[in-house]
């Protein structure tokens, strides 16, 4: 006999990276008929929701109106149908960004590179941090971690046209508190000598999304957030 229900799916809307003082919604999707959802933060009960009518609702939302470092951390949720509880969801790492300072990002040999060359991103932040994160915008969001006193190197390559895209870096004060994002660096990769055409870029967020990623949920972020979250959060762990 089944002792637990399938685990629910947890995510953050519009994004798991939340600028401080902005709002975020944590969503938990379980099953129709669930009478209670519990949101846990860092292992302790954080919030409860009892959907009405339960048979018509399979998802609840927990609203955080004002993000700060105390709200950043690992969230999970569970739900109950009758007396039977579900398995806990995967962990959601909620990150507060725009803390303290803005790093600078440079790329070597430059923003326009040739397929086959090796590329190094350098991220620098003078305030006290030792961990840096390099993020590539887009559907197949790549996140790299680097370490250094004030600067970290992120080697890439040999590059292909798949490396094309917009990169930003963050300084990380801990796993869940990140700096402001750096200015973007757009990496262009031309083909080899025989084929100098540029391949299509990875599907990316609309151009204005990054700066307003907490102000709208109508930019296509909703469709991509699960992929982004999964990649980035595996890295966080």
């Amino acid at each position: 006999q089944q002792q637990t229900l399938p685990k629910p799916f947890i995510w953050a809307e519009p994004h798991f990276m939340v600028p401080k003082e902005k709002q975020v919604t944590i969503c938990c999707q379980g099953n129709y008929g669930a009478v209670e959802y519990q949101l846990h933060f860092e292992g302790s009960l954080f919030a409860v929701d009892r959907p009405k009518p339960p048979e018509r609702i399979n998802k609840v939302k927990f609203y955080i109106p004002d993000m700060n470092s105390r709200m950043a951390g690992q969230y999970s949720c569970i739900y109950r149908v009758g007396e039977l509880w579900s398995e806990p969801s995967n962990l959601l790492d909620l990150v507060v960004t725009e803390m303290y300072d803005t790093p600078t990002l440079s790329v070597h040999p430059g923003p326009e590179v040739i397929s086959g060359e090796k590329v190094t991103f350098y991220c620098r932040l003078d305030t006290a941090t030792s961990m840096f994160l390099l993020l590539k915008e887009g559907r197949s969001s790549h996140v790299q971690r680097g370490y250094g006193k004030v600067q970290a190197e992120f080697p890439l390559g040999p590059v292909t046209t798949a490396h094309r895209g917009t990169y930003r870096c963050f300084g990380s004060y801990n796993n869940h508190a990140w700096s402001f994002p750096s200015e973007p660096v757009k990496l262009l990769v031309t083909g080899d000598i025989e084929n100098t055409s540029l391949a299509p870029e990875d599907p990316t967020f609309p151009a204005d999304t990054w700066g307003t990623y907490l102000l709208t949920t109508e930019t296509g972020l909703q469709k991509d957030h699960a992929l982004w979250d999964h990649t980035a959060q595996n890295l966080l762990r």
Partner: antibody, heavy 115, light 107 residues
Framework: QVQLQQPGSVLVRPGASVKLSCKAS????????MHWAKQRPGQGLEWIGH????????NYNEKFKGKATLTVDTSSSTAYVDLSSLTSEDSAVYYC????????WGAGTTVTVSS | DIQMTQSPSSLSASLGERVSLTCRAS??????LNWLQQEPDGTIKRLIY???RLDSGVPKRFSGSRSGSDYSLTISSLESEDFVDYYC?????????FGGGTKLEIK
């Protein structure tokens, strides 16, 4: 066209420091890396480090950490390498080179360390 | 650090001859390799970048190629001004490193 102007030569005393300059023109100074390299008489080239004038990000060959400090003055489009505690081993030609792929090279400055 | 082993260290050849210089990389550097030419007065000029791309203004007799971890500079028909020093340089992984150089002498 791109020009990287370096002083021809400089004579310094052992134990002293020297600041070598590389004045750039013909391109946007803040958009390209600036590298420095050393060549001892009759020897090959060694990379000292590089700096990005826009971000101030610099990176050094471990061998030259504590010996060389790279800086830039964006207002005059000039890059500098500061060499400290000079010994006869530091007598060499020092080159600046523009761009991540070392696109263009200065003519080099000959540093002679002698009492 | 990546070692760049350049060979030969010196080479005697005749005008009109075809010669090849080689650099072997100790680690993968992709196509991040330059060939530089140094005149007797110390002037350095880049000839080839990204393994095989010819710089503008460089004569077509110069060409670059790669076979695995071996990178070659070929001069198809030597002219008098080619008898100078040549260096390879990898810019794949910091610290960027140079080959030991090849002195090309006239026979």
């Amino acid at each position: 066209q791109v020009q990287l102007q370096q002083p021809g030569s400089v004579l310094v005393r052992p134990g002293a420091s020297v600041k070598l300059s590389c004045k750039a023109s013909g391109y946007t100074f803040t958009s390209s890396w600036m590298h420095w390299a050393k060549q001892r008489p009759g020897q090959g080239l060694e990379w000292i480090g590089h700096i990005h004038p826009n971000s101030g990000i610099s990176n050094y060959n471990e061998k030259f950490k504590g010996k060389a400090t790279l800086t830039v003055d964006t207002s005059s489009s000039t890059a500098y390498v500061d060499l400290s505690s000079l010994t006869s081993e530091d007598s060499a030609v020092y080159y600046c080179s523009r761009g991540g792929r070392f696109d263009d090279w200065g003519a080099g400055t000959t540093v002679t360390v002698s009492s | 650090d990546i070692q760049m082993t350049q060979s030969p260290s010196s080479l005697s050849a005749s005008l009109g001859e075809r010669v090849s210089l080689t650099c072997r990389a100790s680690q993968d550097i992709g196509s991040s390799l330059n060939w530089l030419q140094q005149e007797p007065d110390g002037t350095i000029k880049r000839l080839i970048y990204a393994t095989s791309r010819l710089d503008s203004g460089v004569p077509k007799r110069f060409s670059g190629s790669r076979s695995g971890s071996d990178y070659s500079l070929t001069i198809s028909s030597l002219e008098s001004e080619d008898f100078v020093d040549y260096y390879c340089l990898q810019y794949a992984s910091s610290p960027w490193t140079f080959g030991g150089g090849t002195k090309l002498e006239i026979k």
